[in-house]
């Protein structure tokens, strides 16, 4: 049904879905704090631009009676129930900030006539790609996939002289929401990653992973997994690892690696960690937070969602344009706005671009060091450490297939 939007005459409302099932187990209070901080900044920015308007947020809570798993498994219907609640109340804002679960976002997008923008902190899966009115403020799986293919093909760096075309992917079903969809994308037979690789096998059991580490008949030296160092240690322990094994640990929303006092444990020496560059800081600056880094990224995406809305509202109001139009709904893409931690760039499809950082453990210092960075906006790799102190032979990454000569 057509719901009137509370979005005109100098009063602009943001509908914030506060779902019990969410990509990260973040207290809703923290999300509220993030939204409120964003509102305070947006009001200030609009006022500074001479726009005397009111901007508020309405928090829409689900009753949590039916959909109470707390994770994303029962989020599909929860999202639709919240939309129904908005519809019944005849109260929709100019923009919907909310669903973080891929399931709920996909279903809500499918089942509604979206004439308003939807901003998501999450929705990592490939099924949420290329949605005309959806903006995603945390790196989606497509961005990871493009990095991996780019890195696999790279063969002209001092530390990587072989193209790779094979990989194992470890995926045991206990992953967090972000990891689940990242690995899901790598597993999908029709995905870009699968298309570009000659060999790819998914390891689903701990024992399969453990056996590969020393299996002389393995088909690839490269194993991709997703999680933190502790997750890897639980799986790998202190087991011996063949010298040409490379583990790629995807841990995007964790900037503990950049803290000054962090020492890499010994079991990380065969590992390259893929993470995100830590916000507005220089790499290797020290900082501390009492929120776990992942949770800060999640709440920050809500905050940046508010700032993005403020950015678009300012542009449309300054141009004398109507907010409740398809043009506004489709405008949340292909732009850069001032986010809380610095500029935020959205690509042509409304997905956040970022700098991914590949780290290695220095055998000399036992510290994490930046090997290279990758700009998702231009799909380009930039080497940082031309003479890394690797554990691998000759300080070069091995070939992905044992015994295969230079290519």
């Amino acid at each position: 049904s057509q719901v009137s939007q509370n979005c005109h005459n100098g009063s602009y409302e943001i509908s914030v879905l506060m779902m019990g099932n969410s990509a990260f187990a973040e207290p809703l209070k923290n999300l509220e704090d993030a939204v409120n901080e964003g509102l305070e900044i947006v009001r200030g920015r609009l006022q500074n631009a001479g726009l005397n308007v009111t901007v508020n947020a309405t928090f829409m809570y689900s009753d949590g009676l039916i959909h109470n798993s707390g994770d994303c498994r029962s989020s599909t219907c929860e999202g639709l129930d919240l939309l129904r609640k908005i519809s019944n109340a005849q109260r929709m804002g100019c923009v919907l900030i909310g669903p973080s679960c891929t399931y709920s976002t996909f279903q809500m997008y499918l089942d509604t006539e979206l004439s308003y923008p939807m901003i998501s902190a999450g929705s990592f899966g490939l099924s949420c790609d290329y949605k005309e009115t959806l903006t995603r403020l945390m790196s989606p799986a497509r961005k990871l996939m493009y990095f991996l293919v780019n890195f696999w093909k790279t063969n002209d760096l001092p530390f990587k002289t072989y193209s790779w075309s094979t990989s194992y992917v470890y995926k045991n079903g206990t992953e967090t929401e972000d990891c689940f969809w990242y690995l899901n994308a790598l597993e999908a037979s029709v995905s870009y990653f699968s298309h570009e690789l000659g060999f790819k096998v998914v390891l689903r059991q701990d024992k399969e992973f453990q056996d590969i580490l020393m299996d002389h008949n393995r088909k690839s030296n490269v194993i991709i997994m997703c999680g933190g160092p502790e997750f890897l240690y639980k799986l790998k322990g202190d087991r011996a690892v063949a010298e040409d094994i490379v583990i790629i640990l995807v841990d995007l929303f964790n900037d503990q690696y950049f803290e000054d006092n962090v020492t890499a444990p010994d079991y990380m020496k065969n590992v390259l960690v893929l993470t995100l560059s830590p916000g507005n800081s220089l790499l290797n600056s020290s900082f501390s937070r009492n929120l776990s880094p992942t949770k800060r990224d999640f709440a920050l995406a809500y905050l940046n969602g508010i700032l993005l809305f403020g950015h678009m509202l300012k542009i449309f109001l300054e141009n004398g344009e109507n907010i409740t139009t398809p043009k506004f709904a489709h405008a949340f893409r292909n732009l850069t706005f001032e986010g809380y931690d610095g500029p935020v760039t959205l690509d042509d499809w409304g997905d956040v671009d970022s700098t991914m950082v590949l780290l290695y453990t220095s055998v000399d210092t036992k510290k994490y060091k930046v090997l290279l960075t990758y700009d998702t906006h231009v799909n380009k790799t930039y080497p940082v450490d031309m003479s890394p102190t690797f554990t691998w032979k000759n300080s070069k990454l091995p070939n992905d297939i044992t015994g295969r000569g230079p290519q």
Partner: nanobody, 115 residues
Framework: EVQLVESGGGLAQPGGSLRLSCAAS????????MTWVRQAPGGRLEWVAK????????YYADSVKGRFTISRDNAKNSLYLQMDSLRAEDTAVYYC????????WGQGTLVTVSS
């Protein structure tokens, strides 16, 4: 260990001025938005002013706009609040806080405006 220490509070006449300082340590100050928050006796917390990590954006609550000025010196890890044209209703304990979720607070400094 993260620490925020406020100073500069005291007794001021209506129409007078005070300058509050907040010394930060234990984290990279230049990465964080900072906010001054106040709590009047028996009242609720109210944000007063906030400043971006590089000082390029400053925002004020309507109640203090035009009278208070927030600033920072990242080289000295310090946050400031210049309070002019003070009123009785500015009487409160003033806290400096870090980041959007105000995850760290100082012990506060009491400002009393009275004739």
């Amino acid at each position: 260990e993260v620490q925020l220490v406020e100073s500069g509070g005291g007794l001021a006449q209506p129409g007078g001025s005070l300058r509050l300082s907040c010394a930060a340590s234990g984290f990279t100050f230049s990465r964080y938005w900072m906010t001054w928050v106040r709590q009047a006796p028996g009242g609720r917390l109210e944000w007063v002013a906030k400043i971006k990590y590089d000082g390029s954006e400053k925002y004020y609550a309507d109640s203090v706009k035009g009278r208070f000025t927030i600033s920072r010196d990242n080289a000295k890890n310090s946050l400031y609040l210049q309070m002019d044209s003070l009123r009785a209703e500015d009487t409160a304990v003033y806290y400096c806080t870090r980041d959007y979720n105000k995850d760290y607070w100082g012990q506060g400094t009491l400002v009393t405006v009275s004739s």
